[in-house]
């Protein structure tokens, strides 16, 4: 807190301008009127106040708006946003995408801070859902944003917003998140033709069920190994050798390098060795010829 001291003669600020950067903290406190600051917030970001000077300006706004800043002030906070705590931000009602963009710009190039996370949370809750424009904006600033959401939060993403998602936006998503996103992507891209559909759906396939993988295997998609390795193990296990061969196309040779890793390892254990031998890759660990395979899970389900 800056001590309350009288403003020196001739130093009372009549407008927010560059001369104020030479004011000491106590002079800013004494000589800058909070109402003037609020009405001229658009000028603050054009003036290179230091981090310590911003403390004083924030203190003034806090006194003027104890219940939270109006959006007219918020949209012009600029670097002052860096001074806000999550508690401050929870008092705000941010409805404009332009305001959100302006504040995200200040934090550009940095990790998502607790302040930014709180701001986004307030904004999305205020909108009721994560619409395409918002998602476009958020993933542009934070490619990992989608994967920071819980499956419950992701359920509010409308399928139309999926068009905004780029492959790199899903890099850090776990299977639970992809389970939620995949059906939305399938719906969003359903009217595309085979090859175009596969290009769009590919990064979501970590949430695909067996029947969809079987269907893809009939479409000459030539899935790369990196995508295959991200598939759900439970979705890959029921695929036959022939289906995996069709699914991977020329990339099938890559199975050898991955034979000790999931899901390839587990899939090999479920295949007949003589079926695996037809691939000519030297994959080992399949069910020896002459052995009978009982699917106990199916038996339990029937009983």
């Amino acid at each position: 807190e800056v001590e309350k001291t009288a403003c020196p003669s001739g130093k009372k600020a009549r407008e927010i301008d560059e001369s104020l950067i030479f004011y000491k903290k106590w002079e800013l406190e004494a000589c800058v009127d909070a109402a003037l600051l609020a009405t001229q917030m658009d000028r603050v970001n054009a003036i290179p106040f230091t981090y310590e000077q911003l403390d004083v300006l924030k203190h003034k706004l806090d006194e003027l708006y104890p219940q939270g800043y109006p959006e007219s002030v918020i949209q012009h906070l600029g670097y002052l946003f860096l001074k806000m705590s999550p508690e401050d931000i929870r008092k705000w009602n941010v409805t404009s995408l332009e305001t959100l963009k302006a504040l995200l710009e200040v934090n550009k190039g940095h990790e998502m801070s607790p302040q930014v996370a709180t701001l986004i949370d307030r904004f999305v809750k205020g909108r009721g859902q994560l619409d395409k424009d918002t998602l476009d904006t958020l993933t542009a600033f934070y490619p990992g944003y989608l994967c920071s959401l819980s499956p419950e939060e992701l359920s509010s993403v409308p399928p139309s917003s999926i068009w905004a998602v780029r492959p790199q936006d899903l890099d850090t998503c776990d299977p639970r998140q992809l389970d939620v996103l995949y059906p939305k992507a399938r719906l969003a891209f359903q009217n595309m033709n085979g090859s175009e559909y596969f290009v769009k759906i590919q990064s979501f396939l970590g949430g695909a069920p067996t029947e969809d993988l079987k269907a893809l295997s009939q479409q000459n998609v030539s899935m790369d190994l990196a995508t295959f390795m991200k598939l759900r193990t439970d979705a890959v296990l029921p695929l036959t050798v022939a289906e995996v061969q069709k699914l991977l196309g020329p990339h099938v040779e890559g199975l050898k390098a991955e034979e000790r890793h999931r899901p390839v390892r587990d899939w090999i254990l479920r295949q007949r060795q003589d079926d695996l031998d037809t691939l000519g890759l030297g994959l080992q660990g399949g069910i020896p010829n002459g052995y009978l395979v009982l699917d106990l899970s199916m038996q339990e389900a029937l009983s």
Epitope: E18, F22, K24, A46, T50, Y51, E52, L54
Partner: antibody, heavy 120, light 107 residues
């Protein structure tokens, strides 16, 4: 990478003016305040002022007010610092420098410096 | 204006030994202090900011500490390439001001 390339050394007579240039590359010229700092022989560093290339806003340290003029030419990403009514104690190396985050005014990148000698 | 007083003016330290440079501000500047290294014939290079945060690529033998009015730059094990003049700078308020510099040499 960010580069600030300054003009060559100058020798001036007392009372004359000098104009030093600083050509920027490797970043968006209009994004950051350009500062000027000088260093007299064997002395410390002294901040002179700054200019924002996008708005042409200038802020001068009052010690140099009335004698210094900072300008930019956006078309060639170049900043200029002109100091008039030169005195012998203006003999110094003049540096341009940029600050990436204005609220944290530490000097992230510097030009190589321009030696200005004021001598009769 | 905030005056930054550096000490000592010069310092001679043996290779591998610790070097300590001090800087005192005339008013509290919080942790708004940066340190620069200037080798002969070169422009200054940023080493430390926020009093203790190392700039990208700066070796971890350089350590900054302090807050308020007293600040220290420490080089834990002096290397030949550390011979230079070191400056502190406050950025709590304008005008930005620097210390007069400490010349570091090898004993």
């Amino acid at each position: 990478q960010v580069q600030l390339v300054q003009s060559g050394a100058e020798v001036k007579k007392p009372g004359a003016s000098v104009k030093v240039s600083c050509k920027a590359s490797g970043y968006t010229f209009t994004s950051y305040w350009m500062h000027w700092v000088r260093q007299a022989p064997g002395q410390g560093l002294e901040w002179m002022g700054m200019i924002h290339p996008n708005s042409d806003n200038t802020i001068y340290y009052e010690k140099f007010q009335g004698r210094v003029t900072m300008t930019v030419d956006k078309s060639i990403s170049t900043a200029y610092m002109e100091l008039s009514r030169l005195r012998s104690d203006d003999t110094a190396v003049y540096y341009c420098a940029i600050i990436i985050t204005p609220v944290v005014p530490k000097f992230d990148y510097w030009g190589q410096g321009t030696l200005v000698t004021v001598s009769s | 204006d905030i005056v930054m007083t550096q000490s000592p003016d010069s310092l001679a330290v043996s290779l591998g030994e610790r070097a300590t440079i001090n800087c005192k501000a005339s008013h509290s500047v919080g942790t708004s202090v940066a340190w620069y290294q200037q080798k002969p014939g070169q422009s200054p290079k940023l080493l430390i900011y926020w009093a203790s945060t190392r700039h990208t690529g700066v070796p971890d033998r350089f350590t900054g500490s302090g807050s308020g009015t007293d600040f220290t730059l420490t080089i834990s094990s002096l290397q030949a390439e550390d011979v230079a003049v070191y400056f502190c700078q406050q950025y709590s308020s304008y005008p930005l001001t620097f210390g007069a510099g400490t010349k570091l040499e090898i004993k």
